[in-house]
Interface confidence: medium
């Protein structure tokens, strides 16, 4: 039969605009070994890790996505447009394919929020 395995993720994470965030999926299995990990933003490829060939980051993200830590990704210089679903796909042998989902919410930076509040309240003072 198929070898059982599980993927654990933080289902919802948040980060500030301009900041960075770590996207991480944790795969656990007694016997199955990871052969490849794919990371996608919706259906857009972010990066691939292959046990044999190492990391490759897609061209469109190559200036903002750094492999690691472990089999995760560090996503830098975040914009509001980066808000959305991210998927990790673990290809394992002999266990098959396992998928995890993370929802990333990119928020206005605290500096921007504070600045906006001060601007709005200043005329009332």
């Amino acid at each position: 039969g198929a070898t059982a395995g599980t993927i654990d993720t933080k289902r919802n994470i948040s980060a500030e605009e301009g900041g960075s965030v770590i996207l991480q999926c944790h795969f656990s299995s007694d016997t199955a070994e990871v052969t490849q990990v794919d990371w996608k933003q919706q259906d857009q490829l972010l990066a691939i890790y292959s046990v044999d060939l190492g990391w490759h980051v897609a061209s469109v993200f190559s200036d903002r996505v750094v492999p690691g830590p472990s089999l995760g990704l560090t996503f830098q210089s975040l914009t509001m447009n980066d808000t959305g679903e991210y998927f990790c796909t673990y290809h394992t042998y002999p266990g098959g394919i396992y998928k995890g989902r993370i929802f990333l919410k990119v928020q206005e930076s605290s500096d921007d929020r504070n600045g906006l509040a001060q601007f709005q309240t200043a005329p009332l003072g």
Epitope: D43, L45, W55, H56, V57
Partner: antibody, heavy 116, light 106 residues
């Protein structure tokens, strides 16, 4: 065996759109990535863009605004469209396959000249 | 973008020579490097991937070495059919090529 063949017009007018077709055999487009790479006369190679096995695309950021890559998997064809061509787009255009991020099989290329 | 610098741009050698072509990356690309052979009017050929893995069907006189930022392609015993232009390519982040080394016979 794996084969790729590029086809399209040899001459394109400035400001017009280039349309190229890559016809592949020996592998399914739903399992492998196909890229476009070009070589201007006397210069090096430049990666243009790719369509992944999933159908998602990845473009050279410097060319992205002028590019569209799509495919017809049932016909084993990948299409490149590049608009607003200028003389500096004159090059040999190659399509190439990757199972990973290096290019293991290439077509012979098609020479495209941008001139009025 | 990761920049790739190849040297020399032109190399003249004799049949039987051991020749070395160099490629330097602008940042650490680990072993994510490939070498290609280009001849006019022919399909380019993958020689080496993952810095030192020989592609199937490529003669064993071709070998690759290096990791991080410094890489080399060595041809041990140059043959007339090796006259071509050679390009390195990184695939760590996106895809970029070196400017090429043209190899000719003395």
């Amino acid at each position: 065996q794996v084969q790729l063949m590029e086809s399209g017009p040899g001459l394109v007018q400035p400001s017009q759109t280039l349309s190229l077709t890559c016809t592949v055999s020996g592998f399914p487009l739903t399992s492998y990535t196909v890229h476009w790479v070009r070589q201007p006369p006397g210069k090096g190679l430049e990666w243009i863009g790719a369509i992944w096995s999933s159908g998602s695309t990845d473009y050279n950021s410097a060319l992205k605004s002028r590019l569209n890559i799509n495919r017809d998997s049932s016909k084993s064809q990948v299409f490149l469209k590049m608009n607003s061509l200028q003389t500096e787009d004159t090059a040999i255009y190659f399509c190439t396959k990757s199972g990973w991020a290096f290019f293991d099989y290439w077509g012979q290329g098609v020479m495209v000249t941008v001139s009025s | 973008d990761i920049q790739m610098t190849q040297s020399p741009s032109l190399l003249s050698a004799s049949v039987g020579d051991r020749v070395t072509l160099n490629c330097i990356a602008s940042q650490n690309i680990y072993k994510s490097l490939a070498w290609y052979q280009l001849k006019l009017g022919e399909a380019p050929k993958l020689l080496i991937y993952n810095a030192n893995s020989l592609q199937a069907g490529i003669p064993s006189r071709f070998s690759g070495s290096g990791s991080g930022t410094d890489f080399a392609l060595t041809i041990s015993g140059l043959q007339p059919e090796d006259v071509a232009t050679y390009f390195c390519q990184q695939y760590s982040g996106g895809y970029t090529f070196g400017a090429g080394t043209k190899l000719e016979l003395k």
